[in-house]
Interface confidence: low
């Protein structure tokens, strides 16, 4: 039985501190008491704490811990949220510009194909946007639909413009003939390859960023166990019960407690590291046909080439289709099939070159570099939290959970804690269900990132890095080649830059599916500036 308190001892300091946590003093003893009902701050002598105070301290300790965890992850969370928003917006802008480039190509080279071509192009790029956002859609179907829709218009407007109205019910036949006769040669297959590869990578890149946000959000809002609450209470508040208001916990003791509290969270570390490294590998491979910016902005040229291919074979095709689709009007092939202005108006599709401009690929690499500085985020969390909460320097004259000590000894502290709870037991419980779920999601995305069919071992070329891959520089492998040769080819460099107000919207473009027939203005194909200054709407 501890000795009774000396008559002059009061709990005045404790009372004034506790009142800040809980207005009203009914739970605080006037003078120190035996404290036999205490379960966490087990007294070595008279104490200024009651059971109710202990409960309040536990609640406060857990809230403090949650706040510390949230502030620890704030920078990382903001980094991923901002970039996910910026990249999504940027990809939408790339799609919009690719659509405008393609519409401009039709407007300047094949005015007779508009407005139907605008409609089909609009549909195609809407599908592209939806695919990037995760829609259940097949890229090959999108490309087939584009060419299936375009061919009847090309046939009736360019190749056989004199068809009588009565013959115009051959559209379905023409759609079928388009594939059977390989009317556009290998161009649809080429576009399928380019678009599917680049969009698949873009889609998984966005999925991975969104999962990154989910991981942080999950660990950010973890509810800590009662055992952890007791450990934190003992570390932060039990010293008050002895009237030791100014003493700080020992640093080593804080690390032990945090490792116990965060044992489950730290299990994410292995998968988080793999996530960042896999994402880096994906980003390093996002070039040439794996870079949607490069592919989509060069599509207008490939589509142009595909129409030229049709025109070159117009004579043969007209005869074959005449028999196949059995319409009465047989026309001779004649040079009038070619529009007067066959090649792309260079004025319209000129994208001003700016040295060392910020491209999407450089922005992606910048994100990876920043993410890599957080690669040890989860394993370093316990130490981070201790360094951002009050602890005694050099572990001298500090609180070890039971008493004020001159120097912290982990062994002594553990022996002292033995009867209060088992730290090892707390660690062995395994992660929370939500943490297990997020680990499973990380495993899944890591597997997806690893199995992406992308070129391994990119050789970084200074010119390639700074200026971007030129869409005219075709290698031997046609799958890797954006656009054909020919006089009409324009090299659109991978140099899309960003508007400071990335979140601008065109009403017409925002409508799903059916709103994208606006005729592109000549000045609509502009360059972007200043991605770094974007203020994310998700901040």
């Amino acid at each position: 039985q501890p000795p009774p308190p000396p008559p002059d001892a009061t709990c005045h300091q404790v009372r004034s501190f506790f009142q800040r946590l809980q207005p009203g003093l009914k739970w605080v003893p006037e003078t120190p008491v035996p404290g036999s009902d205490l379960q966490v701050c087990l007294p070595k002598g008279p104490t200024c704490c009651s059971r109710k105070m202990e409960e309040k301290y536990q609640l406060t300790a857990r809230l403090n811990m949650e706040q510390l965890l949230q502030s620890a992850s704030m920078e990382l969370k903001f980094l991923i949220i901002q970039n996910a928003a910026v990249f999504q917006e940027a990809f939408e802008i790339v799609v919009r510009h690719a659509k405008n480039y393609t519409n401009a190509m039709f407007k300047n080279n094949y005015p007779s194909l508009t407005p139907q071509a605008f409609e089909f192009v609009g549909e195609f790029f809407t599908d592209v946007s939806l695919y990037i956002l995760g829609s259940d859609i097949n890229v090959d179907d999108m490309v087939n639909e584009l060419f299936d829709s375009l061919f009847p218009v090309i046939y009736t407007q360019l190749m056989n413009p004199g068809l009588p109205d009565s013959a115009l019910d051959i559209n379905e036949c023409l759609r079928g003939a388009r594939r059977d006769l390989k009317v556009f040669g290998n161009f649809p297959k080429l576009i399928m390859t380019q678009v599917s590869k680049s969009l698949q990578v873009t889609r998984i890149f966005l999925q991975a960023l969104n999962l990154g946000i989910e991981v942080i959000n999950t660990t950010d809002h973890l509810k800590f166990s009662k055992d952890c609450g007791r450990m934190l209470t003992r570390m932060w508040y039990c010293s008050y019960c002895q009237g030791l208001m100014m003493v700080k916990p020992c640093g080593g003791y804080c690390n032990v407690v945090m490792q116990g509290c965060m044992a489950g969270v730290v299990e994410i570390d292995k998968y988080w590291r793999e996530y960042i490294l896999s994402l880096e590998e994906l980003v390093n491979g996002m070039y040439r046909i794996y870079d949607m910016e490069n592919v989509l902005l060069g599509l207008f040229s490939t589509i142009h080439d595909s129409i030229q291919y049709v025109q070159k074979n117009a004579g043969k095709l007209t005869t074959t289709i005449g028999k196949l689709c059995a319409h009465s009007q047989q026309r001779q092939y004649r040079s009038a099939y070619y529009p007067e202005d066959l090649f792309i108006d260079k004025k319209v599709l000129k994208v001003a070159h700016v040295e060392h401009e910020e491209t999407l690929s450089s922005r992606r690499r910048e994100l990876i570099q920043k993410l890599k500085s957080f690669i040890s985020f989860y394993s370093a969390l316990p130490g981070y939290i201790c360094s951002h909460s009050p602890v005694a320097e050099n572990d001298t004259l500090c609180w070890n959970g039971q008493e004020l000590v001159e120097r912290y000894s982990q062994k002594a502290a553990r022996n002292g804690m033995k009867n209060q709870f088992n730290l090892h037991e707390l660690k062995m419980k395994g992660p929370e269900p939500v943490v297990s779920q997020i680990i499973d999601k990380l495993k899944h995305i890591n597997q997806l990132l690893r199995t992406m069919s992308m070129p391994k071992g990119r050789v970084l070329d200074k010119n390639l890095d700074e200026e971007g891959f030129e869409s005219g520089d075709c290698g031997d492998d046609e799958d890797e080649c954006i656009g054909g040769s020919g006089d009409g080819m324009i090299k659109v460099k991978n140099q899309l830059r960003f508007l400071a107000e990335l979140a601008y919207d065109l009403d017409v473009d925002d409508a799903p599916g059916n709103s994208q027939q606006a005729t592109p203005k000549d000045n609509e194909i502009s360059t972007f500036h200043n991605l770094g200054n974007v203020h994310s709407p998700l901040k």
Partner: antibody, heavy 117, light 110 residues
Amino acid sequence: QVQLVQSGAEVKKPGASVKVSCKASGYTFTGYYMHWVRQAPGQGLEWMGWINPNSGGTNYAQKFQGRVTMTRDTSISTAYMELSRLRSDDTAVYYCARSWTSGFDYWGQGTLVTVSS
Amino acid sequence: QAVLTQPPSASQTPGQMVTISCSGTSSNIGSNYVFWYQQLPGTAPKLLIYKNFQRPSGVPGRFSGSKSGTAASLAISGLRSEDEADYFCAAWDDALSGYVFGAGTKVTVL
């Protein structure tokens, strides 16, 4: 299979607000736009607006601007449409409808909102 | 007041053909796809025709759509009693930045 299940019928007084929910299942909720269309008794269909469940972006018909709010909760694959300052001519069946590039291919069963003093 | 114009009703005997017209302007039908919806009594609308003439799977070949300029039409051949319903046309309107519908046509099988 794709399903859109809406909340039950509501009776409201003029000036009040109503919030109708639409729970989606059987597909990727964030991959398709969700539209709201209403139909007054014995009348035609009237488009109110859409929400992009992925970004939360919205586009409202001019007629409803300022009175309608469309939101979503991706964690439970649910879209919401709230109409405020109700008038008697807002009495209608309110439908949610999923769209892709092929029109409104799936519709909810409809929620009857009656505005009466 | 519906933006797209449809006749209020159309009727025909079983097995015959009925055609419903839908006229608009250059900002809706003239520059965008037309969609047709069927609404059976007491049920939600159902997509019948999309992108002017395409049929979703499950819609019989008796239903066909077409578009010319700023007008569209829906034809139902081999009319059956179960085709008795309201039919609505719809299109995106560039000027209004929204979808617009016709007032609907009630088809009666005599």
